[in-house]
């Protein structure tokens, strides 16, 4: 069943910069993503950004840049001007909507004890942290290898020293997936890597949309940073909430995506489906 994950990160380089990563894990198509802070959208929260797969993005201060990372995940960079860093104790919520099936939302925050550049799970999760496990495991393997080499050297000085092949460790082994199941859903969680579509297929706008949607910057070169991040961008730890069960299924036989004026889709992209309607184009 579809799930929503939310991760809040403090940038290691700039302590005043935060990034909210949100993603949808499931078989549906997203028609709109809303990021808010201080609570859920429509329930006391304040909108920070709205991302439309075709019309682009709109954002409000202190949001600095909102962008699609994949077809099912987004990131929002925030600039904290205050010295007291109020973001550290703030709840950030992401609402994923698939019209008309429904909307679901999940929230997360950066724990006060978080190290810069890392994000810890929002609630205690009884699993060994994969980053520590990976580092310890790798250290153990190296120590064992060194010991074994010394052992071989002592016992078989007449033999040439065997060459140690470098270990091709997948950087995903260093990723901590600290999933905190919602109280509402106790279903077993599936492998998050299996459901994220890592193809990067955003839509861009050549001009500002008449409804006020801002033009998207060209960002095809950006690497995804969600759970399906490429090996070149390992994430050391990830705190996450998952949403309650909900369903998203693409209705067969619907019209192809509507492209408004000045809209350019990336080639070979099968973006979220467009439900019958005008997307606000007049």
């Amino acid at each position: 069943t579809p799930e929503v994950w939310v991760q809040v990160q403090m940038e290691a380089t700039e302590l005043s910069s935060f990034t909210v990563h949100c993603g949808f894990l499931g078989p549906g198509s997203i028609s709109l993503v809303t990021v808010s802070w201080g609570g859920p959208d429509g329930a006391g929260g304040t909108k920070l950004a709205v991302l439309h797969p075709e019309l682009g993005t709109r954002q409000w201060a202190p949001a600095r840049q909102a962008r699609w990372e994949t077809q099912s995940s987004i990131s929002l960079a925030l600039e904290d001007s205050g010295a007291s860093s109020p973001f550290a104790n703030t709840t950030f919520c992401c609402k994923f909507a698939s019209f008309p099936e429904g909307s679901w939302e999940s929230c997360g925050s950066l724990p006060p004890s978080s190290d810069p550049g890392l994000s810890a799970p929002p609630t205690p999760v009884p699993i060994l942290r994969a980053d520590l496990a990976g580092i310890l495991g790798l250290s153990g393997v190296l120590l064992f290898g060194c010991g074994y080499l010394l052992h071989l050297l002592r016992r078989q000085k007449h033999r040439p020293t065997p060459r140690l092949q470098p270990s091709h460790t997948n950087s995903q082994a260093l990723t901590a997936q600290a999933w905190a199941p919602s109280q509402a859903s106790q279903a077993a969680l599936h492998d998050p890597y299996a459901t994220i579509n890592t193809s990067f297929c955003p839509a861009t706008l050549d001009t500002a949309h008449p409804n006020g949607w801002a033009s998207l910057p060209t960002h095809a070169a950006h690497q995804p940073q969600g759970p399906a991040a490429s090996a070149s961008t390992p994430i050391l730890a990830r705190g996450s909430f998952v949403s309650v069960e909900n369903g998203l299924y693409t209705q067969a036989g619907e019209r192809p995506p509507h492209t408004g004026p000045g809209l350019t889709l990336f080639p070979d992209c099968r973006g979220p489906r467009a439900v019958e309607g005008r997307f606000g184009v007049r």
């Epitope: 028609s31 959208d41 019209f99 929230c107 509402a184 909900n246 019958e276 005008r278 606000g280």
Partner: antibody, heavy 122, light 106 residues
């Protein structure tokens, strides 16, 4: 307080059209979709369609395709459902409802209008 | 469209008893919503996404199921629980409701 207030009862002749309004208050109108459900006397519920109040997208039940039109007026926070080519079997109570957002660890609430009885009779 | 069949059509029970209402889908659906409707009133959401209680719904209500078979259970009936109950699927357009189960006092 969230409220959805619908227009009053209507009596129509076969072949005519009816336009039912649903005025929302107590929340940000464009934050929630509105869907319409009808219920014939003594019968069950039937989904007619949903409108995205923010983008004016609509999704209709194929059964009513071509006969139903849902629109919204953001200036008055009102949604309209128009049903044309009325026949006797369209006699029903028509409800508008605010679609709920499923949010982890927050209360999920739905809100409905009081219903509008539309009678189609010659 | 996906046809939802509720059973039984009418269920006669006494306060304090346990009620089990079933909803069978013509083809597999991902989840089920349940609504309660009392005479002269609009429906009210009880259970969303198969097993989650909507705001203000007493804990005696619970939902379960998967695939094509879903169940609404009321552990101990209160006088205000006697009403008509509808299941609804949103996995496939058009969204459909069951024909309803009338829960009446025996």
């Amino acid at each position: 307080e969230v409220q959805l207030v619908q227009s009053g009862a209507e009596v129509k002749k076969p072949g005519a059209s009816v336009k039912v309004s649903c005025k929302a208050s107590g929340y940000t109108f464009t934050d929630y979709w509105i869907y319409w459900v009808r219920q014939a006397p003594g019968q069950g519920l039937e989904w007619m369609g949903t409108i995205d109040t923010s983008e004016h997208k609509t999704s209709y039940n194929q059964k009513f395709r071509g006969r139903v039109t849902m629109t919204r007026d953001t200036s008055t926070s009102t949604v309209y459902m128009e049903l044309s080519s009325l026949r006797s079997e369209d006699t029903a109570v028509y409800y508008c409802a605010r679609d709920f957002i499923i949010t982890v660890n927050y209360p999920v609430v739905d809100y409905w209008g009081q219903g509008t009885l539309v009678t189609v009779s010659s | 469209q996906i046809v939802l069949t509720q059973s039984p059509a009418t269920l006669s029970l006494s306060p304090g008893e346990r009620a089990t209402l079933s909803c069978s889908a013509g083809s597999s659906v991902n989840y089920m919503h349940w609504f309660q409707q009392k005479p002269g009133q609009a429906p009210r959401l009880l259970i969303y996404s198969t097993s989650n209680l909507a705001s203000g719904v007493p804990a005696r209500f619970s939902g379960s199921g998967s695939g094509t078979d879903y169940t609404l259970t009321i552990s101990s009936l209160e006088p205000e629980d006697f009403a008509v109950y509808y299941c609804q699927q949103r996995s496939s357009l058009p969204f459909t409701f069951g024909q309803g189960t009338k829960l009446e006092i025996k």
